[in-house]
């Protein structure tokens, strides 16, 4: 969490941002809130990116104002116009690109004063893994697949019964480049699995950590997946 305060002249206002991560090819949100004003027409929101000449987005007098917008953000940005009045200056970003990563500044002017806060935005690819029993294999084998990751993640297997065991010798992980030549499909196979045990396939890079669990008993198979973004810090 980054909390910024206004500078000279008028009173300062508090602006708060949260570091976040964007999944390339999907839509992202850069979070920013501020002390609200009574009149929408008195609020100016400017989003800037370090190293970029033009603006990312500007909203003033109740409307978007993109005359100074940088070409790389054309057609890809919007604020939540109906929420600006309550202090939400968060930015919607369409079709997140790797090059969108960097330091952004959320700069606010209201009748109460000015304020700004920076936000670190990471970009990459992350997806939920799915673990299945590989019935084609000669021995009891599990197959963990996740369609989109970038940068290349690490894959670690764990089991409830053999806690702390190292499965690197009995697993094999491969990374297959997807058609857009950036993200990769992750496939990891675990051999010699035993029944009545819960196995976890953990995929992690510097942006996200995802886990796919599978519990195999004689009567049923139970699966569970979850994904967690790393380093979501507020400013």
């Amino acid at each position: 969490l980054i909390i910024g305060f206004g500078i000279s002249g008028r009173h300062s206002i508090t602006v708060t941002t949260v570091a976040s991560a964007g999944n390339i090819g999907e839509d992202g949100i850069l979070s920013c809130t501020f002390e609200p004003d009574i009149k929408l027409s008195d609020i100016v929101i400017q989003w800037l990116k370090e190293g970029v000449l033009g603006l990312v987005h500007e909203f003033k007098e109740g409307k978007d104002e993109l005359s100074e917008q940088d070409e790389m953000f054309r057609g890809r940005t919007a604020v939540f116009a109906d929420q600006v009045i309550v202090g939400n200056a968060s930015l919607r970003l369409k079709n997140v690109q790797l090059t969108d990563a960097g330091t952004y500044k959320c700069y606010i002017i209201t009748s109460k004063g000015k304020g700004n806060a920076n936000l670190e935005y990471k970009t990459g690819a992350f997806s939920m893994p799915e673990v299945n029993v590989d019935y084609n294999a000669s021995s009891e084998t599990l197959r963990c697949e996740a369609p989109r990751w970038f940068p290349q993640p690490t894959v670690v297997w764990a089991s409830q019964v053999d806690q702390g065991a190292n499965f690197s010798e009995v697993s094999n992980t491969s990374f297959e480049l997807n058609s857009e030549n950036v993200t990769m499909k992750v496939v990891s196979v675990l051999y010699n699995v035993t029944i009545n045990n819960t196995y976890s396939c953990m995929i992690e890079n510097d942006i996200a950590k995802a886990t796919g669990d599978i519990k195999v008993t004689e009567s049923e198979i139970k699966r569970r997946s979850h994904l967690q973004l790393l380093n979501s810090k507020a400013s």
């Epitope: 090819g25 999907e26 839509d27 409307k63 978007d64 104002e65 993109l66 005359s67 917008q69 070409e71 054309r74 057609g75 890809r76 940005t77 919007a78 919607r92 369409k94 079709n95 058609s179 857009e180």
Partner: antibody, heavy 121, light 107 residues
């Protein structure tokens, strides 16, 4: 409500420049929340997006036509224009102007009624 | 450029039928897809935006679904006024592109 109307010559000679204007009524072209587009449709065929313009004059053109396209805007007349140079018979089409829904969502609504431009000597 | 492929190109149906048109993108476009209806000699009319949002004034028999690369437009009960050509369009990234169209004709 917002209405768009295309105007310009219906016949253009090969190698010349096609010029069309879109007049906006019922709203301001200077509303910063929208991009303004040109789209064309060859006879009996599908739709092709030509490009868009913002009220400040910034443009984006479809790379397939970029070398021949120029768009401009006249906020005082509430109009935006399209010029397509070095035309051939392949540029014969119905030309539409349209507004995007927002700065981030460029589904098109409303559209002008379209104007047929024939390229022939 | 992102290629948009519609199927079928022609569809014969009767009043009251449930009609489904498919649009496939050559790469993921998230939910940035619109559907239009066009009648001969007229401009296209926006039906659906953002894959599933119904444009104001469009009858509720029209619905859109899908995300990523696969999308569908469904007309729950075809009416006489619905015989037309339908186009999908992606606005995920420049240059914006349209599908080739699906003509819905009377069986």
């Amino acid at each position: 409500q917002l209405q768009l109307q295309e105007s310009g010559p219906g016949l253009v000679k090969p190698s010349e420049t096609l010029s069309l204007t879109c007049t906006v009524s019922g709203g301001s072209i200077s509303d910063g929340s929208y991009y303004w587009s040109w789209i064309r449709q060859h006879p009996g065929k599908g739709l092709e997006w030509i490009g868009n313009i913002y009220y400040s004059g910034s443009t984006y053109y479809n790379p397939s036509l970029r070398s021949r396209v120029t768009m401009s805007v006249d906020t005082s007349k509430n109009q935006f224009s399209l010029k397509l140079s070095s035309v051939t018979a392949a540029d014969t089409a119905v030309y539409y102007c349209a507004r995007g829904l927002s700065t981030i969502d460029e589904a098109f609504d409303p559209w002008g009624q379209g104007t047929l431009v024939t390229v022939s000597s | 450029d992102i290629q948009m492929t519609q199927s079928p190109s022609t569809l014969s149906a009767s009043v009251g039928d449930r009609v489904t048109i498919t649009c496939r993108a050559s790469q993921s476009i998230s939910s940035w897809l619109a559907w239009y209806q066009q009648k001969p000699g007229k401009a296209p009319k926006l039906l659906i935006y953002k894959a599933s949002s119904l444009e104001s004034g469009v009858p509720s028999r029209f619905s859109g679904s899908g995300s990523g690369t696969e999308f569908t437009l469904t007309i729950s009960s075809l009416q006489p006024d619905d015989f037309a050509t339908y186009y999908c369009q992606q606005d995920n990234s420049y240059p914006y592109t349209f599908g080739g169209g699906t003509k819905v004709e009377i069986k």
